[in-house]
Interface confidence: low
Amino acid sequence: GVTSAPDTRPAPGSTAPPAHGVTSAPDTRPAPGSTAPPAHGVTSAPDTRPAPGSTAPPAHGVTSAPDTRPAPGSTAPPAHGVTSAPDTRPAPGSTAPPAH
């Protein structure tokens, strides 16, 4: 893992999510704006939380506020599919929508 890198998170608009395991990658959480969001079932997607909404929509509390976390633990679990991807946090706001 990355242990000697700076403790900041990547800024939006970077060309790729941080390459974890590479010692020059920052010790941070990726910000929105990378090249692609997590795609379900696509093994080259980052090692991220898969996007709920494939098999069932997120049945979670907050629905009217776009930039809020739907509360987990409700009726629909996140749809899982990205299993072998590399280790980065998802980079939202990118060019391709999640493949549901």
Epitope: T3, P12, A51, T83
Partner: antibody, heavy 128, light 112 residues
């Protein structure tokens, strides 16, 4: 239901080792980032270590760096903390914690980065 | 590291009355993505912590609406509009904007 159960705590002498385990159930373990967070007796919370969902990215608090190693076995739905060169100041309840980072929907992704599931903890006592 | 400072250390409250807890960070918690990853946790006696609020003001699933969060940048507040007996415990703020993840020292809410 979603559950995290820690084990492996106990009494150990300074300089000794322990391996903590955390058994996860009720959710897809391999999709979640996990952390160990500890709480010394009568004190506040201290983040110890973090591991990404596939286990390739690991971060540590300075206080444990070089002594503790976090790992996971997604096939066994388990998280581990190998603790070496233990010191009296490592005495604490150790919590296994799930971190949820966000979701994507309709081409947009949303982040929240929060610790939403906590185990009941396992107690580590370092004393001669 | 980001230092999280909570006040007061202890807050004796009368049942049914409001309570307010302040949390100040040593630097801005605004992430480069525009979000502020500030959470509040409750720890009842003898129990593990429980998530109450995330991203400053969003109540987590199942959290009563008497709990609310507010603030921006470096200054944040957790309010309990009407304290109930089950609210007794220690409350922690936590930042997840930057590693290492850090917590406030805690505020003990007790009944007068």
């Amino acid at each position: 239901q979603v559950q995290l159960v820690e084990s492996g705590g106990g009494l150990v002498k300074p300089g000794g080792s322990l391996r903590l385990s955390c058994a996860a159930s009720g959710f897809i373990f391999s999709d979640y980032y996990m952390s160990w967070i500890r709480q010394a007796p009568g004190k506040g919370l201290e983040w110890v270590s973090y591991i990404s969902s596939s286990g390739t990215t690991k971060y540590y608090a300075d206080s444990v760096k070089g002594r503790f190693t976090i790992s996971r076995d997604n096939a066994k739905n388990s998280l581990y903390l190998q603790m070496n060169s233990l010191r009296a100041e490592d005495t604490a309840v150790y919590y296994c914690v799930r971190e949820d980072i966000g979701y994507c929907s309709g081409g947009s992704c949303f982040y929240y980065y929060y610790m939403d599931v906590w185990g009941k903890g396992t107690t580590v006592t370092v004393s001669s | 590291d980001i230092v999280m400072t909570q006040t007061p250390l202890s807050s004796p409250v009368t049942l049914g009355q409001p309570a307010s807890i302040s949390c100040r960070s040593s630097q801005s918690l605004v992430h480069s993505d525009g979000n502020t990853y500030l959470s509040w946790l409750q720890q009842r006696p003898g129990q593990p912590p429980r998530l109450l609020i995330y991203k400053i003001s969003n109540r987590f699933s199942g959290v009563p609406d008497r709990f609310s969060g507010s603030g921006a940048g470096t200054d944040f507040t957790l309010k309990i509009s009407r304290v109930e007996a089950e609210d007794v415990g220690v409350y922690y703020c936590m930042q997840a904007t930057q590693f290492p993840l850090t917590f406030g020292g805690g505020t003990k809410v007790e009944i007068k």
